[in-house]
């Protein structure tokens, strides 16, 4: 580390005095200090001498000696005060520029350390500092305004008490620049626009920034539009607005509109699409299949997407049957707007009952007319099974009817003993019916199938069981021949058929 002679941190001299500052290092050394007149510099290998024969208040400042070859970058410093009774301040710069929230150093150096107790910072023409101005003072460096704000961009003077009166420095202009985080913020409204040919339309492009220096323009299909600009300042932001008014739109006005704004940080752009149509339109669609199947007791939400211009004048859900004349409860119908021209309508059908199967229609109306979208809702049921014993042309026959949706599959089991359900160990024979005959298959109803098993001779210590299953569940019915006739066992009850 270089060494300065005299080896004191501060040196106080009078104007006109001779000052010699000597710096000695291991290698070559360099001096750095405030730009001031009358200094002469003499270098001799590893030492450098800075001297003046006529010190003035302008020589007040901190002089630092560095050794460029030192890898540790060590330095030594001495602060020189040239105390001029007429000049308490040495101002190193008359303009200071910082960004908001940085510390701003106003470099008015006190020429006499004794005056430190009576210093203050004021605005020019004796005006007090703005409220919330947080500052500190260093006799070596000057006044520091901490976390400077844009509003603190003012002309300041440093004040010192000398013999009971305040002596001011020359003024220092502080410029606090807004931190521009990026390109200007943009809004382009509306985000989407539809008009019928001949109608009026308005597109507004606006940009705002903390700094006034930015440009904004509106373009249509890559052509820049000449639109007068309105400017404003509020909420600490500069705003520039371009408004495109079209009295009677035509097809050539349709297309892509881009709002573009730029500043030193870069460019922002946002776009919207303007659609010009010949007449009103109303389109209904659903992402769901229009044919729905749900298990009885479960819930379902029917959703319809509506695209319309102009807006809807009416809409409703209607139940078209076939089971009853009930209508969907309004509280179960829900509407949400996705954007100006698209809406979603939902009908909630919780805990579906058999009578709620059928057709549900969503109807909507606008000046373009009525449109409807119809869902067909079929309920799924687990099979219900029943078996009867009958004679046809003298042949004994077991008839199994199974009712459910989807269409049930039918299996016959013949097993030993009397039981209401054949288990694997008892099974003597199994017949899977590949083609049970459909007895009824009405839309929205259960499908009823019938399977016929001819029985040449009834074995009395055996059970015939008809089982039916589908994707929802299964059901069964056991038939037990006895000498007096026949017993049939439904799943949960006992029935006697003579």
């Amino acid at each position: 580390i270089p060494v300065i002679e005299p080896s004191v941190p501060e040196l106080v001299v009078k104007p006109g005095a001779t000052v010699t500052l000597r710096c000695v290092g291991n290698g070559s050394v360099e001096w750095d200090g405030p730009p001031s007149p009358h200094w002469t510099l003499y270098s001799d290998g590893s030492s450098s001498i800075l001297s003046t024969n006529n010190a003035t208040f302008q020589n007040t400042g901190t002089y630092r000696c560095t050794e460029p070859g030192d890898p540790l970058g060590g330095s030594a410093a001495i602060h020189l005060y040239v105390k001029d009774p007429a000049r308490p301040w040495n101002v190193l710069a008359q303009e200071v520029v910082v960004f908001e929230d940085q510390d701003a150093l106003l470099p008015c150096l006190l020429t006499d350390p004794v005056l430190e107790a009576g210093v203050s910072l004021v605005r020019v023409r004796g005006r007090p500092l703005m409220r919330h101005t947080n500052y500190s003072f260093s006799p070596w460096h000057g006044f520091t305004i901490h976390r400077a704000k844009f509003i603190q961009s003012q002309d300041y003077q440093c004040s010192a008490l000398m013999g009971g009166r305040k002596v001011m420095s020359i003024s220092i202009r502080l410029k606090v620049q807004k931190v521009i985080p990026g390109p200007p913020a943009l809004t382009l409204v509306p985000a989407e626009l539809v008009r019928i040919r001949g109608e009026a339309a308005q597109i507004v492009c606006s940009a705002s920034s903390v700094d006034v220096n930015f440009d904004v323009f509106l373009q249509h299909n890559n052509t820049k539009l000449a639109i007068p600009q309105q400017s404003d300042f509020h909420n600490n932001r500069y705003q520039k607005v371009l408004t495109l008014n079209l009295d009677q739109v035509d097809f050539q006005h349709a297309g892509n509109y881009s709002c573009v704004a730029s500043n030193v940080q870069g460019k922002h752009s946002t776009s919207m699409f303007f659609r010009v149509v010949e007449s009103a339109y109303l389109n209904l669609s659903s992402e769901q299949n229009l044919i729905q199947e749900v298990t009885v007791g479960e819930g379902l939400n029917l959703k319809v997407m509506v695209e319309a211009y102009p807006g809807l004048q009416g809409f409703n859900w209607t139940y078209l049957g076939p089971f009853s004349d009930h209508q969907p409860e309004p509280k179960l119908a829900n509407a949400t707007t996705k954007d100006t021209y698209r809406h979603t309508f939902t009908l909630s059908l919780p805990r579906l009952k058999p009578s709620e199967a059928g057709r549900y229609s969503f109807l909507a109306r606008n000046p373009g007319g009525w449109r409807a979208l119809t869902f067909e809702l079929t309920l799924r049921y687990p099979p219900e099974v029943s078996v009867i014993w009958t004679f046809i042309n003298g042949s004994g026959t077991l008839l199994c009817a199974a009712s459910g949706y989807p269409q049930p599959n039918v299996t016959w089991l013949q097993c030993s003993g009397h039981t209401d359900r054949c288990d694997e160990a008892q099974v003597l024979q199994v017949w899977d019916d590949p083609y049970p005959e459909v007895l009824s298959q009405e839309p929205f109803h259960k499908v009823t199938v019938q399977s016929l098993l001819t029985v040449e001779t009834l074995e009395h210590n055996q059970t015939y069981e008809c089982r039916a299953h589908n994707s929802v569940g299964s059901g069964s019915w056991a038939f037990i021949p006895i000498s007096a006739g026949a017993h049939t066992h439904p799943p949960d009850e006992f029935l006697f058929t003579p």
Epitope: I392, S395, N409, W412, W431, D433, E437, Q450, L452, T454
Partner: antibody, heavy 120, light 112 residues
């Protein structure tokens, strides 16, 4: 015992219809279905369709537009009608009883066959 | 439609020999309920076809036990362990797993 007797013409003009009646005995048409099958030198045996015991019908899609099968349970009659005949419809036409679930609907009894020639 | 193929068209055998008649389907004959509905018929000269075997391997009542059926999926075989004179005729395989039901072209069993 089970019997199926067929009655119908032997010669049919092109574009005309073929009608065959199958009269059954020894079982009930309410218990068993009836199939119709034909045998021709060029195509071998072809299943044309059937009428189930409950009256439902299943047709081979190749003949659906011109085939009708009906029945009269009380008279034990099954009726077969094939429209718009062409020379390649020349074949022996059989009615055959479905064996029911115990035989998995395989055809356990057949009629004697009706030999049909389509020619002008 | 399921195509049933029966090679060969003619199968010459000596009486008392074993005969094997094959049948192949263009797709699996397993029905959605898991069963395979493949049947065998015999048509003797001047007669109507008669059912011999149903559901791959079940002999119809009255059919001699020298007739047996086997196979699964798409490949099926009818075996006659000792051919007798009354066995001569055309053998047809048939499926009722998928509508429309279809028949093979037939294999004629004749004396060598």
């Amino acid at each position: 015992q089970v019997q199926l007797k067929q009655s119908g013409p032997g010669l049919v003009q092109p574009s005309q219809s073929l009608s065959i009646t199958c009269t059954v005995s020894g079982f009930s048409l309410t218990t068993y279905g009836i199939n119709w099958v034909r045998l021709s030198p060029g195509k071998g045996l072809e299943w044309l369709g059937m009428i189930w015991r409950g009256g439902n019908t299943d047709y081979n899609a190749a003949f659906m537009s011109r085939l009708t099968i009906t029945k009269d349970n009380s008279k034990n009659h099954v009726f077969f009608q094939l429209n718009s005949l062409q020379p390649d419809d020349t074949a022996i036409y059989f009615c055959a009883k479905s064996g029911g679930l115990r035989l998995y609907y395989a055809m356990d009894y057949w009629g004697q066959g009706t030999s049909v020639t389509v020619s002008s | 439609d399921v195509v049933m193929t029966q090679p060969p068209l003619s199968l010459p055998v000596s009486l008392g020999d074993q005969a094997s008649i094959s049948c192949r389907s263009s797709q699996s004959l397993v029905h959605s309920n898991g069963n395979t509905y493949l049947h065998w018929y015999l048509q003797k000269p001047g007669q109507s076809p008669k059912l011999l075997i149903y559901k791959v391997s079940n002999r119809l009542s009255g059919v001699p036990d020298r007739f047996s059926g086997s196979g699964s999926g798409t490949d099926f075989t009818l075996k006659i362990s000792r051919v007798e004179a009354e066995d001569l005729g055309v053998y047809f395989c048939s499926q009722s797993s998928h509508v429309p039901w279809t028949f093979g072209g037939g294999t004629k069993l004749e004396i060598r």
